[in-house]
């Protein structure tokens, strides 16, 4: 025998109090799949969280972080403070990168400068706490037919994909 609740589409729930008819989800709740016996409460984006996508009867709200913070965890479960470029976020707060390391992002930790000599290249431009060393072309790049130096990468929003 088919469960009558299986006919209830997303955005509704199977109401046991009303002879298992399909009732619309109440305000501030949703059901993303059919055949649900309850609707889930919508996520509320409060404090450092801001609403990226409003809740609807068929899908939960999605949050991201207010400026100065970035998302961590599946579905942006947490907002963590940004640091400045040239810094890293430690458990004790933002801290300047040590000499020989850099961070060109507002999150993450400081990365060691590239050691150009490992690939037989010379240093074209010394590194800073915000920028890596720039190496000269490798011997392979100087050979006939080799491709030229790559232009800078487009700006991107770093983070785990998908969030």
């Amino acid at each position: 025998l088919q469960d009558p609740c299986s006919n209830c589409p997303a955005g509704t729930f199977c109401d046991n109090n009303r002879n298992q008819i399909c009732s619309p989800c109440p305000p501030n709740s949703f059901s993303s799949a059919g055949g649900q016996r309850t609707c889930d409460i919508c996520r509320q984006c409060k404090g450092v969280f801001r609403t990226r996508k409003e809740c609807s009867s068929t899908s939960n709200a999605e949050c991201d972080c207010t400026p100065g913070f970035h998302c961590l965890g599946a579905g942006c479960s947490m907002c963590e403070q940004d640091c400045k470029q040239g810094q890293e976020l430690t458990k004790k707060g933002c801290k300047d990168c040590c000499f020989g390391t850099f961070n060109d992002q507002k999150r993450g930790i400081c990365r060691p400068w590239t050691n150009c000599s490992l690939d037989g290249r010379s240093v074209l431009k010394t590194g800073t706490t915000e920028k890596d060393v720039v190496c000269g072309p490798s011997p392979a790049d100087l050979s006939p037919g080799a491709s030229s130096v790559t232009p800078p990468a487009p700006a991107r929003e770093p983070g785990h994909s998908p969030q």
Epitope: L72, E88, T90, K91, C98, T101, N103, Q105, R107, G108, I109, C110, R111, P112, T114, N115, C116, L118, D119, D132, V133, V134, C135, S138, V149, T150, P152, A153, P154, R156, E157, P158, G159, H160, S161
Partner: antibody, heavy 120, light 110 residues
């Protein structure tokens, strides 16, 4: 969706070199560092190094310095790892893995692995 | 360079909770990442930066980190959780920035 597809298995003799490729798709190749990690039979994961596909800048684990070279071809969104002077204990599965856009987090996408067998 | 120490194996019955530890000097000051590795498959990131799960990783997998020990916890363990688990940190101050623990085999009893 993000995908890293590696070249096929290789069998090499001691002293030879091997070059493994890792073709990226589903994201901007030059925007994310690529790492190489290997696993020898019955052993754990071992980090080998990274390359910045935008600048070509590299960092290698000291153990591999002088034997490993990481390069990239941005025109075909492909990273390469070449290991020279191969020994029998270089027999391993070699993985490329993507960093998620900033340093200090976990490696979020991995290639399927390339088995390199070094045998005389 | 920095050393991470894991137990070689952890055994647990289905439905129980497994805890896998990763020891290192002042590891609580570092960000620890955990990977699941099954035979003939690529590693999968299951926890990053101590306690955050990537999309698609079930909520019964969690992480914590303080003092000299980081812990990966798998609650209500299932047969499909049987795998090797590796902790990992980045150590910018050394000549070997990427550091993995030796791995722990999670054995599901019965």
């Amino acid at each position: 969706q993000v995908q890293l597809v590696q070249s096929g298995a290789e069998v090499k003799k001691p002293g030879a070199s091997v070059k493994v490729s890792c073709k990226a798709s589903g994201y901007t190749f030059t925007g994310y560092y690529m790492h190489w990690v290997r696993q020898a039979p019955g052993q754990g994961l071992e980090w080998m190094g990274w390359i910045n596909p935008n600048s070509g800048g590299t960092n290698y684990a000291q153990k591999f310095q002088g034997r490993v070279t990481m390069t990239r071809d941005t025109s075909i969104s492909t990273a390469y790892m070449e290991l020279s002077r191969l020994r029998s204990d270089d027999t391993a599965v070699y993985y490329c893995a993507r960093e998620p856009g900033y340093y200090g987090s976990g490696l979020d996408y991995w290639g399927q692995g390339t088995l390199v067998t070094v045998s005389s | 360079s920095y050393v991470l120490t894991q137990p070689p194996s952890v055994s647990v019955a289905p439905g129980e909770t497994a805890r896998i530890t990763c020891g290192g000097d002042d590891i609580g000051d570092k960000r620890v990442h955990w990977y699941q590795k099954k035979p003939d498959q690529a590693p999968v990131l299951v926890v990053y930066e101590d306690r955050y799960r990537p999309s698609g990783i079930p909520e019964r997998i969690s992480g914590s980190n303080s003092g000299n020990t980081a812990t990966l916890t798998l609650s209500r363990v299932e047969a499909g959780d049987e795998a090797d688990y590796y902790c990992q940190v980045w150590d910018s101050s050394s000549d070997h920035p990427g550091v993995f623990g030796g791995g722990t085999q999670l054995i599901i009893l019965g």
